[in-house]
């Protein structure tokens, strides 16, 4: 089939103890080969404090998958989801508020 | 755009203190992104120093460590480079520029400023 | 730290001709790497970032490709305003480290 880009989306969970798990959710996006990774302060964030979810069939002949990090709340600036899909690059923030939600579809 | 210009003396004697500013224009050094200072040596070689972030958190590359200071200036929107107990080997051209949390690549850098380090 | 090691250190060559300069990481930096252009006397500036993607107003005879630890900048017909010297420089983690340079001088 021909290449399908990612829906891209950044959410924050509740606050807990200064801290909040920013999530990075990739969606409808063919093939199933994807980069998905948190970046902070513009490098790589280090393995062992990201958590990746499978890269799952949505049921559209398409794919999703997710990861995640916990960050302190009040420097959600200083990160980045960086998306690679089939050629396509894209940087995603964390939206400043836990009530916004960021989406990104990449042409 | 974002406009920086480096200023500070071109010539410090060794084992002195080495202090230069950056002044930036077009963009708040609060609102966001990480403030850099990088140098560059006669021959060419490139090494990044450090930053100051749009809070004040600092980075500094740990060859430099127990000799470099980034500073800021928050009113005049200035940042600033302090080198203490220089020697011929901090001869440099030296920069600042800035990277978006993005990626730590770097967009645009001031002109430089040569520095010598001689007695 | 990523030491980064480019070559050639210098290259001759004529207007019209292709020319390619690569930069090997001591480690996989997973495509965090850029490229700069630097004419004699000036500042360096950005041509390429995420090891792939040509920053605003670059030339599209500019093209640089790679991964893991291998990445190499192409430049087609060159052009008189081409001359220089290029860097790499990594983005994986700190300390943020650059190639020692590839001078690009006419033939």
């Known amino acids: 089939g021909s290449t399908v880009p990612p829906m891209v989306n950044v959410t924050c969970s509740e606050v807990s103890e200064g801290n909040i798990t920013v999530t990075c959710r990739a969606s409808s996006f063919y093939p199933r080969n994807i980069t998905l990774t948190w970046r902070q302060d513009g490098v790589s964030l280090s393995h062992n404090t990201q958590q990746w979810g499978d890269v799952l069939p949505d049921g559209n002949g398409t794919y999703q998958t997710w990861v995640a990090t916990r960050i302190r709340q009040g420097e959600e600036q200083r990160f980045t989801c960086y998306m690679e899909h089939s050629g396509n690059h894209g940087t995603h923030p964390v939206p400043s508020g836990n009530s916004h939600h960021h989406h990104h579809h990449h042409h | 755009d974002v406009q920086l210009q480096e200023s500070g003396p071109g010539l410090v004697k060794p084992s002195q203190s080495l202090s230069l500013t950056c002044t930036v224009t077009g963009y708040s050094i609060t609102s966001d992104y990480a403030w850099n200072w990088i140098r560059q040596f006669p021959r060419n070689k490139l090494e990044w120093m450090g930053y100051?972030?749009?809070?004040?958190?600092?980075n500094y590359n740990p060859s430099l460590k127990s000799r470099i200071s980034i500073t800021r200036d928050t009113s005049k929107n200035q940042f600033f480079l302090q080198l203490i107990s220089v020697t011929t080997e901090d001869t440099a051209t030296y920069y600042c520029?800035?990277?978006?949390?993005?990626?730590?690549?770097?967009?645009?850098w001031g002109q430089g400023t040569l520095v010598t380090v001689s007695a | 730290d990523i030491q980064m090691t480019q070559s050639p250190a210098s290259l001759s060559a004529s207007v019209g001709e292709t020319v390619t300069i690569t930069c090997r990481a001591s480690?996989?930096?997973?495509?965090?790497l850029a490229w700069y252009q630097q004419k004699q006397g000036k500042s360096p500036q950005l041509l390429v970032y995420?090891?792939?993607m040509l920053a605003d107003g670059v030339p599209s005879r500019f093209s640089a490709s790679g991964s893991g630890t291998q990445y190499s900048l192409k430049i087609n017909s060159l052009q008189p305003e081409d001359f220089g010297s290029y860097y790499c420089q990594h983005f994986w983690s700190f300390p943020l480290t650059f190639g020692a340079g590839t001078k690009v001088e006419i033939k």
């Open positions: 995420n090891a792939i």
């Open positions: 100051i972030n749009y809070s004040g958190t600092t």
């Open positions: 520029s800035y990277y978006r949390y993005d990626g730590a690549w770097f967009p645009y």
């Open positions: 480690g996989n930096i997973h495509n965090y």
